[in-house]
């Protein structure tokens, strides 16, 4: 995500429009406590990070409260007073939505409607993945709102479901992150189950963004 400057690689994650995490990997400075300085306005003085992430006892990132912030993060990673990486980035391009909340299942014969609370901002896709013990891989369906109906299910089979949220690529670009998955929920004959008996540990989901 970050071009290298003096061998510094950066990663930015904007958690649900609330918190920004900037991490760095700087092999040249692996035993050095680099400092992180930032501002949200191009004309303000830099503030220093107050919430560092540590790796093997050295600074490796910063967590910033970015609620009510709506645009560009200007930042500088420094070795003492010497900047080793300076950049500005529109934060929205690194959005990671929060995991779906209040996931509910409504069954009607061979179909289920999966709903959850829509996030407060738009241009998102709500993806449901599901499989039965007889499926070799996860099936997927997504909608613009958290109201996804899956038809053609076999009422006698047990199905595992989980849900996540993704930012639409044509709006937010290719560098966003899907949310974490919701917990796996298992259903059979319209009733919740502890697990689908024949299913071992669920396989890795498809990594489609």
């Amino acid at each position: 995500q970050g071009g290298a400057a003096e061998g510094v690689q950066i990663q930015i994650i904007y958690f649900n429009l609330e918190t920004v995490q900037v991490t760095w990997n700087a092999s040249k400075y692996s035993r050095t406590n680099l400092t992180f300085h930032y501002r949200f306005n191009g004309d303000e003085a830099y503030d220093q990070c107050t919430n560092y992430l540590l790796q093997e006892g050295h600074t490796s990132g910063c967590l910033l409260d970015a609620e009510q912030r709506d645009d560009i993060l200007y930042f500088s990673i420094r070795n003492g007073t010497h900047p080793v990486f300076t950049a500005s980035r529109w934060m929205v391009y690194y959005l990671k939505p929060s995991s779906p909340k209040h996931v509910r299942f409504s069954w009607h014969q061979d179909a289920v409607t999966v709903t959850c609370s829509d996030l407060s901002y738009g241009d998102l896709l709500y993806e449901v993945q599901y499989r039965s013990p007889f499926d070799t891989e996860w099936q997927s369906k997504q909608e613009n709102t958290c109201n996804v109906t899956i038809e053609g299910l076999d009422a006698e089979k047990c199905y595992s479901f989980w849900v996540r949220v993704k930012a639409m690529e044509d709006v937010y670009g290719p560098d966003t992150y899907p949310s974490d998955w919701s917990e796996v929920t298992c259903w059979q004959r319209g009733e919740i189950r502890d697990a689908c008996a024949e299913t071992p540990t669920p396989p890795k989901p498809k990594l489609s963004k």
């Epitope: 995500q1 970050g2 071009g3 400057a5 429009l17 191009g42 912030r69 709506d70 645009d71 560009i72 950049a87 500005s88 980035r89 529109w90 934060m91 929205v92 391009y93 959005l95 407060s120 901002y121 738009g122 241009d123 044509d170 709006v171 937010y172 670009g173 290719p174 560098d175």
Partner: antibody, heavy 125, light 106 residues
Framework: QVQLVQSGSELKKPGASVKVSCKAS????????ISWVRQAPGQGLEWMGW????????RYAQGFTGRFVFSLDTSVSTAYLQISSLKAEDTAVYYC??????????????????WGQGTLVTVSS | DIQMTQSPSSLSASVGDRVTITCRAS??????LAWYQQKPGKAPKLLIY???TRGSGVPSRFSGSGSGTDFTLTISSLQPEDFATYYC????????FGQGTKLEIK
């Protein structure tokens, strides 16, 4: 359809002030941010900053703080650019441009699909 | 700032020609690049965003490519209405534009 209509050309003396307006129609004004872009005669395009039409929060690019003020009147779906203490080097066409894709609840992202027709501000004694 | 450098600064071509304009960013901007067309006395018009996605109503003869620091805008077969100035713009950081490429009739 989306339209941004700007106020007419202005001729001002050095030291004076000017206020350029940008009236939006064809969409919900508070849903998308408005940027201001400057183009000096025969020159390229320069982003001046943007204003969040939902919160009213202005953000100024480096070099456009102090004499430049972005404001809004959401009741008439209009954004304003005011420049005070005008100098000869402020002579330029000023454009308003609407954020293309990202809604104000999220912020902005610097892509401009819709533009006003431009307002020429000439500063001369 | 991220500097955007366009080349050439001007070029002459004929109707029907294939034309390529290049844009180089001073640092990696991934695919966060737009191309605009501007005619004299008019506002810029968005042609391409995400380096290769055509804007609404933009003819298919316009195409964009590139990623990282090097980008191109190609007009496959020039039409009379295509003679204008073209600007690239990065939106990875706060927006900056290239200096423009003036496309003139030969």
């Amino acid at each position: 359809q989306v339209q941004l209509v700007q106020s007419g050309s202005e001729l001002k003396k050095p030291g004076a002030s000017v206020k350029v307006s940008c009236k939006a129609s064809g969409y919900t004004f508070t849903s998308y941010g408005i940027s201001w872009v400057r183009q000096a005669p025969g020159q390229g395009l320069e982003w001046m900053g943007w204003v969040n039409t939902n919160t009213g929060n202005p953000r100024y690019a480096q070099g456009f703080t102090g004499r430049f003020v972005f404001s809004l009147d959401t009741s008439v779906s209009t954004a304003y650019l005011q420049i005070s203490s005008l100098k000869a080097e402020d002579t330029a066409v000023y454009y308003c441009a609407r954020e293309g894709f990202i809604r104000t609840v999220v912020g902005a992202a610097g892509r401009f699909v819709y533009w006003g027709q431009g307002t020429l501000v000439t500063v001369s004694s | 700032d991220i500097q955007m450098t366009q080349s050439p600064s001007s070029l002459s071509a004929s109707v029907g020609d294939r034309v390529t304009i290049t844009c180089r960013a001073s640092q990696d901007i991934h695919t966060r690049l737009a191309w605009y067309q501007q005619k004299p006395g008019k506002a810029p018009k968005l042609l391409i965003y995400w380096a290769s996605t055509r804007g609404s109503g933009v003819p298919s003869r316009f195409s964009g490519s590139g990623s990282g620091t090097d980008f191109t805008l190609t007009i496959s077969s020039l039409q009379p209405e295509d003679f204008a100035t073209y600007y690239c713009q990065q939106y990875s950081a706060y927006p900056t534009f290239g200096q423009g490429t003036k496309l003139e009739i030969k």
